[in-house]
Interface confidence: low
């Protein structure tokens, strides 16, 4: 169960209530988590995770990735700025979920659990965010445009981008987590 | 930079079997997500894909030619090869090999070698 | 399988903006990638994915797709861009590239 609707959680009335920071720190390790268990069945089916990460480094795909200006990195950090960011970036990356769904056999539901707790991470985050104006939302005929051509793909291209969508997404997550420890 | 060579026979029968080979060097046929072509230009004319062999070994052909060619590699060698069966004169061309990058989601094809012109006639 | 199709040739004036344009197969679903040749060589690949250019290609290609139609653009055309342009996307099953027929352009003054 994604954190956020824990049911245990309202089952202790004991515990302290998680705050804000706590909640999506819990959610993006819980995210992380489901990654994990998506790249463990990916890895498995074919030798894609021994490829050195440099011959996969440069693609097509534009997905989201941290840098220098957008303040997430200690060096420059800008709290305002790297949050917009990291929403931002989670929105540019829900398109890249919905493809990964149908696209794992044993893991399916692993893989609805990351796109729905991913949805929730937003929401999380939208609500820390004071300026929501900075922040820009995917064109939906775009990102239906690339779901068609990225579900046209052959097989070994879509291995290769089911890989490419678990490994940078697990990166901007560690990136963001790390990010906002420091808020 | 990679590179890719043709080698072959420039003159075959009709109804023989047409063997060509492309040699890379600069990269290796087996890196993850790319894919390795032949692509053949008839004399005036435009270009034609023929197939497609990927980094894993998996092959796919051009429906048209399906029937006629193969595609194999030497991993030892970094090459890969065509084989055009039943040839006639239709199928002199300027033949071409051609990686497609991890890099490129579709299927562009970002380095061709030089071409080898093979010619059938008896 | 279903060929793409291309105007067989086109003329520019030296300086203005050139427009080949590709429709067909499974445009509406593959990416579009375009190349240059040039007599007697191998061609080069100048836009890949509809719309991106491989680095030491100049900025006066760009490509763009929209409802089964392909544009590459050449803006401020150059003596040198003289040569056949072809279009190549994949066919409905992901599986076999397609090559359009060509498009021979010539660059006038």
């Known amino acids: 169960v994604p954190p956020g609707e824990d049911s245990k959680d309202v089952a202790a009335p004991h515990r302290q209530p998680l705050t804000s920071s706590e909640r999506i720190d819990k959610q993006i390790r819980y995210i992380l988590d489901g990654i994990s268990a998506l790249r463990k069945e990916t890895c498995n089916k074919s030798n894609m995770c021994e490829s050195s990460k440099e011959a996969l480094a440069e693609n097509n795909l534009n997905l989201p990735k941290m840098a220098e200006k957008d303040g997430c990195f200690q060096s420059g950090f800008n709290e305002e700025t790297c949050l917009v960011k990291i929403i931002t970036g989670l929105l540019e990356f829900e398109v890249y979920l919905e493809y990964l769904q149908n696209r794992f056999e044993s893991s399916e539901e692993q893989a609805r659990a990351v796109q729905m707790s991913t949805k929730v991470l937003i929401q999380f985050l939208q609500k820390k965010a004071k300026n929501l104006d900075a922040i820009t939302t995917p064109d939906p005929t775009t990102n239906a445009s690339l779901l068609t051509k990225l579900q046209a793909q052959n097989q070994w291209l879509q291995d290769m981008t089911t890989h490419l969508i678990l490994r940078s997404f697990k990166e901007f997550l560690q990136s963001s987590l790390r990010a906002l420890r420091q808020m | 930079e990679v590179q890719l060579v043709e080698s072959g026979p420039g003159l075959v029968k009709p109804s023989q079997t047409l063997s060509l080979t492309c040699t890379v060097s600069g990269g290796s046929i087996t890196a993850s997500f790319d894919a390795w072509s032949w692509i053949r230009q008839p004399p005036g004319k435009g270009l034609e894909w023929m197939g497609v062999?990927?980094?894993?070994?998996?092959?796919y052909y051009s429906p048209s030619l399906k029937s006629r060619t193969s595609i194999s590699r030497d991993t030892s060698k970094n090459q890969f090869s065509l084989q055009l069966s039943s040839v006639t004169p239709e199928d002199t061309a300027v033949y071409y090999c051609a990686r497609k990058s991890s890099w490129l989601i579709g299927y562009g094809m970002d380095y061709w070698g030089k071409g080898t012109l093979v010619t059938v006639s008896s | 399988q279903a060929g793409l199709t291309q105007p067989s040739a086109l003329s520019v004036t030296l300086g203005q903006t050139a427009k080949i344009t590709c429709q067909g197969g499974?445009?509406?679903?593959?990416?579009a990638h375009w190349y240059q040749q040039k007599p007697g060589q191998a061609p080069v690949l100048v836009i890949y994915?509809?719309?991106s250019r491989p680095s030491g290609i100049p900025e006066r290609f760009s490509g763009s797709s929209s409802g089964g139609r392909a544009t590459l653009t050449i803006s401020g055309a150059q003596a040198e861009d003289e040569g056949d342009y072809y279009c190549?996307?994949?066919?409905?099953?992901?599986?076999?590239?397609?090559f359009g027929g060509g498009t021979h352009l010539t660059v006038l003054g």
């Open positions: 994915d509809d719309d």
């Open positions: 062999i990927a980094y894993d070994g998996s092959t």
């Open positions: 499974s445009l509406g679903s593959s990416y």
């Open positions: 190549q996307s994949a066919d409905s099953s992901g599986n076999a590239a397609v």
